[in-house]
């Protein structure tokens, strides 16, 4: 029996009661907040092989082990995740083990164990052989292993039962609990699971099977399960479904989840049902259930009951997410916010079509209107009084509409008007009129020369570089001295650099009236020398990375009230020389046999270049003598200490914090403070603990059903 | 996979309150779909009654409104009928059934109930 | 309510024969999203109903391609193009798109 679309039990224990006929689980399985410690001995659920989302557990009172409740769990699809996790187990208080003796596959995702106070047997299991990758595993804050002395079954009788394999370069046997041994199949199966027997599957199965070489035999299915056979892809007519079986369109058509309630039904796209259409298609039609490709973005119609939307705030813009169409009218009315500029761009970037007026005032946060970024079109189908479709009115600093060298914008009807907005240029508004086709439409009160552009540099001479010097983290660049019509009008120059991966910026990207900017910006006065030309160094830059960078002349902005000429560059592009790279990441090795390693690894965080090789080194080690002291295999031997509490917040303190043995003769020496790599990162592992553990939280709890 | 089975009183006395149980396996009534009562009195058509939607929210059929409850237990994964002061017109099989976006998909094997002193 | 009217209201039908059942509703059932939700369900004796077709002529997959739906506004017909013995029960008309939901008083097939 397939059960979904998604089980979450909490609180009682008796909901676990739910799960007594599901084989498969299309969704994920949650279970937690159960404070009363109860006996989940009566609880078995030998039926549950499969699930094809996640498995989280958190906060279950007096559960040991999962084995028990799951003896036959088999796969973990991970077809979604959890934060990036297929497997979480958090903050279970009494697990001792995970005993999943029979979990063979975590197909997508990693796992999140953590702070699980007396969960042992983690290093006993070589995740390695269910995961594809174990980089990303978080195995935190629980018992440590020194206390738990795991160990596998026969290892006292000195009789192993289990396999070994090499983990972080320790060979040792592999298994889940003290009497369950980790499944391995034999290396003649390659990739493909094995019987109990140690038979092979069928390559079409996974994890497990009950026959050898039998597609409708199979625990799990490696790619869709139709009709009780595990199939490659999907038969025709029939469709993938949740990543893992084959439905027909009658069943696609009838879906209604409550994630998807408000949309329009599922659609059959690309062989698979699915909630939505891709990105860059749409419905063929609003009650279709294909997708076409989209021309350019797919149109999003948003239409506002009362005719006029007024986006005062970062809140109001958010409504407008994805929108490209907007039935209605646009007031802008933007005093004040933070990060105002590309918050707006975010929720409002990808508008492409106003049908009614388009107003913008008071809105003194504004130094640009390029937040609108794909506005191309202004039907003016509803006008102000005075037959106005683009209103700009007392906007204090305003100085930019848009880059009128990579946009077209039609006003369709109606007129503009543009007041008191000081640092708005006349000649910017003329340029609008030009592009947006209004030119002739305008009365001569409708655009205020005296008013708009009073307080601005308007008429700019071009500054030009002379010469550029880079290294691997500075640039030297220095211009032309700018002289003009008066010296003493020349304060000093302003010089704008940001990372440009892409040489598409604009001197008003992310750019707001009240602090926010994308720009990094340094002051540059006059040389006292006039014959030397200014310049500046720009250091503590990122090797290999292209910057932008322009600069712009300080001038007194007005003269007995008239305008007075400024001057700026054009935005120049520059790249920093190539560095040393960083060291490779996650690297591991494991010996495959007696006279052969193989290392993996992943490649820098940050090449700082293009990479062309790697150097592998590696020298013959000692045996460690250590390591021959104590008899691992007795039980009595391992020295216990305390309890272990589960955090992972605060440092446990050795018997002497002082000092640590260094080894030879060297005798003990003072521990090695942290360097400032190791400080950064354990702020930011502590960080992202954080913003885990937030997530969690904000998942689960939810109100209490009515 | 999904199963529905409804279970009551097989006979409720007149004026009484008439309650079924459909308890359903293999989809959890939260999850998504509208979860329906229809009954059909012998030898008779098929009635729609209403529905409790995966969000709780009912809707009824209008000349049984004042009469009729649909409730769910979601941890038990069930939903309920009640039909108040029930006469001999409310004899019927009773079915539960879950709804989609266009079809009724999954039905219960109906329970008969008998209104009779 | 929307009213469902099926005729006939009895069938008697000969194997290998059409059959044909007619459904009209009192309004139109065309919903507010463009779709017409109707539906006809087979009730076999003993049996819980079974779906046939969806959205007026959508066979259910499983479904006999003899069992076909037509019609659109107020009007809609099941046709059967060859009746076999196993078809014999009680049809039903059925429209989803207008609450309340409503039944036709269905039409029973039965063999000659």
């Known amino acids: 029996e397939i059960c979904g679309p998604g089980i979450d039990i909490r609180n009682d224990y008796q909901q676990l009661k739910r799960l007594e006929n599901c084989t498969v689980i299309e969704g994920y399985l949650h279970i937690l907040l159960i404070s009363k410690a109860e006996d989940y001995r009566s609880y078995r659920f030998p039926k549950l092989t499969v699930i094809t989302e996640y498995l989280l557990l958190f906060r279950v009172a007096g559960l040991e082990s999962l084995g028990d409740l799951f003896p036959n769990l088999t796969v973990i699809r991970g077809w979604k995740l959890f934060y990036n996790y297929a497997l979480v187990i958090f903050e279970m208080t009494n697990l001792k083990d995970i005993g999943l003796y029979n979990l063979r596959n975590i197909t997508r995702g990693a796992i999140r164990i953590e702070k699980n106070a007396d969960l042992c047997y983690l290093s006993t299991v070589d995740w390695s052989l269910i995961l594809d990758a174990v980089s990303n595993n978080y195995i935190v804050g629980n018992k440590p292993p020194k206390e738990c002395g795991d160990l596998c079954p026969g290892t006292m009788e000195e009789k192993p039962m289990c396999e070994k394999t090499t983990i972080n370069n320790e060979y040792n046997y592999r298994c889940w609990t003290t009497n369950r041994c980790q499944k391995m199949c034999p290396s003649t199966c390659g990739k493909r699971a094995c019987t109990e027997n140690n038979e092979c599957c069928h390559p079409e199965c996974l994890g497990s099977c009950s026959a050898p070489d039998n597609d409708t035999a199979c625990v799990a299915c490696r790619h869709y399960y139709y009709a009780g056979v595990c199939v490659p892809a999907c038969p025709p007519n029939t469709y993938r479904f949740e990543g893992w079986r084959c439905v027909d369109r009658d069943f696609c058509a009838n879906i209604l989840s409550a994630e998807s309630s408000d949309s329009e039904g599922f659609v059959i796209h690309d062989g698979e049902c699915m909630q939505e259409c891709p990105s860059g298609f749409i419905r063929n039609g609003s009650q279709s259930m294909y997708c076409i490709p989209c021309e350019g973005p797919c149109p999003k119609v948003c239409e506002e009951e009362k005719k006029t939307k007024t986006i005062d705030s970062v809140t109001s813009a958010q409504m407008l997410q994805g929108c490209t169409i907007f039935k209605g009218n646009l007031l802008i009315n933007i005093r004040r916010g933070n990060n105002i500029a590309s918050e707006l761009e975010n929720f409002m970037g990808l508008i492409e079509v106003v049908t009614g007026y388009v107003k913008i005032r008071h809105s003194h946060a504004l130094v640009s209107l390029s937040f609108l970024k794909n506005l191309r079109l202004i039907l003016g189908e509803e006008q102000l009084e005075g037959n106005y479709s683009f209103y700009v009115l007392d906007n204090q600093n305003l100085q930019q509409l848009w880059d009128w060298d990579h946009r077209n914008l039609t006003i369709k009807a109606g007129k503009m008007y543009f007041a008191f907005n000081p640092k708005l240029c006349v000649s910017e508004i003329y340029r609008m009129e030009e592009v947006t086709g209004t030119k002739g439409r305008q009365s001569k009160g409708d655009i205020n020369t005296r008013n708009n552009g009073e307080r601005a540099s308007c008429e700019s001479d071009v500054l030009h570089f002379t010469s550029t010097t880079t290294s691997k983290n500075r640039i030297i660049i220095t211009w032309h001295r700018y002289r003009p019509p008066d010296y003493r009008d020349l304060i000093s120059f302003t010089v704008y650099y940001k990372e440009a991966p892409f040489k598409n910026v604009t001197e008003y990207d992310g750019q707001d009236a009240c602090g926010s900017n994308s720009w990094n910006m340094v002051d540059v006065d006059l040389p006292p020398n006039k014959d030397v030309e200014p310049g500046i160094l720009l250091h503590g830059l990122k090797p290999w990375t292209q910057y932008a960078v322009y600069v712009k002349a300080v001038t007194l902005t007005m003269v007995e009230n008239d305008h007075i000429r400024g001057a700026k560059s054009e935005i120049l592009y520059i790249r920093t020389n190539a560095s040393v790279p960083s060291i490779p990441l996650d690297v591991l090795s494991a010996s495959n046999s007696s006279s052969q390693l193989i290392v993996k690894w992943n490649p820098p965080s940050l090449p700082n270049g293009n990479l062309s090789y790697y150097i592998v080194r590696w020298q013959r080690q000692p045996q460690d003598g250590y390591l021959y002291r104590h008899n691992y295999c007795s039980k009595d031997k391992i020295p216990i200490r305390k309890y272990a509490d589960g955090t992972i917040d605060i440092e446990e303190v050795t018997e002497n914090p002082k000092t640590e043995v260094c080894g030879g003769e060297k005798g003990p020496c003072c521990a090695c403070p942290k360097t400032e790599a190791e400080k950064q990162a354990e702020k930011e592992e502590a960080e992202y603990r954080k913003v885990f553990e937030n997530f969690l939280h904000n998942s689960i709890f939810v109100p209490r059903p009515e | 996979q999904v199963q529905l089975q409804e279970s009551g009183p097989g006979l409720v006395k007149p004026s009484e309150t008439l309650s079924l149980t459909c308890t359903v396996s293999?989809?959890?009534?939260?999850?998504?779909?509208?979860w329906n009562w229809i009954r059909q009195p012998p030898g008779k058509g098929l009635e729609w009654i209403g529905y409790?939607?995966?969000?709780?929210?009912?809707n009824y059929k209008p000349s049984l409104k004042d009469r009729v409850t649909i409730s769910r237990d979601t941890s038990k994964n069930q939903f309920s009928l009640k039909l108040s002061s029930v006469t001999a017109a409310d004899t019927a099989v009773y079915y539960c059934a879950r709804y989609g976006r266009v079809f009724f998909d999954y039905w219960g094997q109906g329970t008969l109930v008998t209104v009779s002193s | 309510d929307i009213v469902m009217t099926q005729s006939p209201l009895s069938l008697p039908v000969t194997p290998g024969e059409p059959a044909s059942i007619s459904c009209r509703s009192s309004?139109?059932?065309?919903?507010?999203?463009?779709?017409?939700?109707l539906q006809w369900y087979l009730q076999k004796p003993g049996q819980s109903p079974q779906l046939l077709i969806y959205k007026v002529s959508n066979r259910l997959y499983g479904v006999p391609d003899r069992f076909s739906g037509s019609g659109s506004g107020t009007d809609f017909t099941l046709k059967i193009s060859r009746v076999e013995a196993e078809d014999v029960g009680v049809y039903y008309c059925?429209?989803?798109?207008?609450?309340?939901?409503?039944f036709g008083q269905g039409t029973k097939v039965e063999i000659k």
């Open positions: 293999g989809y959890s009534i939260t999850g998504g779909y509208l």
């Open positions: 059925f429209q989803g798109s207008h609450v309340p939901w409503t």
């Open positions: 409790i939607s995966y969000d709780g929210t009912n």
């Open positions: 309004q139109s059932i065309v919903h507010s999203n463009g779709n017409t939700h």
